[in-house]
């Protein structure tokens, strides 16, 4: 399987909510002993490999934000911990895997990485990540709502999390 980032850049005004999304596509094994570990973390654009450095999102580590579920299941973080920090990660039946961040501040700007791992009965088999940039802006130059710029050279889209 592969991980695609629907948008490579999100530009949002301060105070807005945003949902960053990765999509898992390609052949996905849905055997009874296959599960998926999915998580989010912040990183920096390394010279060698993007997403190799791990930093917390609003003080929550990749382990705090992870989901672990069967290949055919949907899941989301119901942890009070994440919600207290204005965060929620979720995964649906269609391969979409997202993190929603509420009440954005300038400190939320940076590179975000999603990680998807296929686990076959206790063994980590396949690890793939995706990366995207979040820019939080303030002042007169800030957009009125979040604008997402596709990974390919398509038109930008206005997107705002509910």
């Amino acid at each position: 399987f592969k991980v695609a980032t629907l948008y490579s850049l999100y530009v949002c005004p301060e105070g807005q909510n945003v949902t960053l999304t990765c999509r898992v596509f390609g052949p996905v094994d849905k055997g009874h002993d296959v599960t998926f570990y999915k998580t989010w973390y912040r990183s920096s654009r390394g010279e060698v490999q993007t997403c190799s450095e791990r930093r917390p999102i609003r003080n929550l580590t990749f382990q705090d934000l992870h989901l672990h579920h069967g290949g055919h299941q949907a899941a989301n973080t119901s942890h009070d911990l994440a919600q207290r920090h204005g965060l929620e990660s979720a995964s649906d039946h269609h391969g979409n895997f997202s993190i929603t961040m509420r009440n954005l501040t300038l400190l939320d700007s940076g590179l975000y990485c999603c990680l998807v791992v296929e686990i076959r009965h206790h063994h980590s088999e396949h690890r793939v990540h995706g990366a995207m940039e979040l820019q939080v802006q303030t002042g007169k130059d800030a957009p009125s709502s979040c604008v997402a710029y596709p990974s390919s050279s398509q038109e930008s889209e206005n997107i705002t999390a509910a």
Partner: antibody, heavy 121, light 106 residues
Framework: QVQLQQSGAELMKPGASVKISCKAT????????IEWVKQRPGHGLEWIGE????????NYNEKFKGKATFTADTSSNTAYMQLSSLTSEDSAVYYC??????????????WGQGTLVTVSA | QIVLSQSPAILSASPGEKVTMTCRAS?????MHWYQQRPGSSPKPWIY???NLASGVPARFSGSGSGTSYSLTISRVEAEDAATYYC?????????FGGGTKLEIK
């Protein structure tokens, strides 16, 4: 926080059976494998087998088939291991451990305190 | 069954020394886990996937290796490191542990 609380020490007669319990708290018990591990002095750690509480699926180390039987009660978040036809070779500390998937790597993430089983005539 | 052989069985070191213990597998593995067991206590997860420290593990610990050869190194041993260290594979049933390396502090 995740905790595994095991039942107390047992002194058993040869030929008897013993049932050890492992009560889990702090996580979704049904979704993660419970592992059972044997430790005899000077023998290190030996994997006995595992049970997935939600489905009741089990996997055994061939060496312990017929010796150990795993069950789980999701209503009480408790896993059990029964050891039958006890001999002195079964005298050991038995641990339950819960699978944790950390950074996408499963391992024995949480351990009970151990249950000492002594088999003596 | 994959056999994990640890050496040395006993390692004696003075505080501040660098020590390395090894774990050899009878078949090639993608990665190795390590656990620490102090006397009278349950094992604790210590190093996952060959080289990643579990939460709370001091940075003086490190892990490395690939294929059939893996090692755990402590850059400067401290008294609290006195314990037995076990390697473990979760690649094939039966899942196995090494025989352990007991670290003694002089």
């Amino acid at each position: 926080q995740v905790q595994l609380q095991q039942s107390g020490a047992e002194l058993m007669k040869p030929g008897a059976s013993v049932k050890i319990s492992c009560k889990a708290t702090g996580y979704t018990f049904s979704r993660y494998w419970i592992e059972w591990v044997k430790q005899r002095p000077g023998h290190g750690l030996e994997w006995i087998g595992e049970i997935l509480p939600g489905s009741g699926s089990t996997n055994y180390n061939e060496k312990f088939k017929g010796k150990a039987t795993f069950t789980a009660d999701t209503s009480s978040n408790t896993a059990y291991m029964q050891l039958s036809s006890l001999t002195s070779e079964d005298s050991a500390v038995y641990y339950c451990a819960s699978e944790e998937v950390y950074d996408g790597y499963p391992w024995f993430g949480y351990w009970g305190q151990g249950t000492l089983v002594t088999v003596s005539a | 069954q994959i056999v994990l052989s640890q050496s040395p069985a006993i390692l004696s070191a003075s505080p501040g020394e660098k020590v390395t213990m090894t774990c050899r597998a009878s078949s090639s593995l993608s990665y190795m886990h390590w656990y620490q067991q102090r006397p009278g206590s349950s094992p604790k997860p210590w190093i996952y996937a060959t080289s990643n420290l579990a939460s709370g593990v001091p940075a003086r610990f490190s892990g490395s290796g690939s294929g059939t050869s893996y090692s755990l190194t402590i850059s400067r041993v401290e008294a609290e490191d006195a314990a037995t260290y076990y390697c473990q594979q979760w690649s094939s049933n039966p899942y196995t542990f090494g025989g352990g390396t007991k670290l003694e502090i002089k």
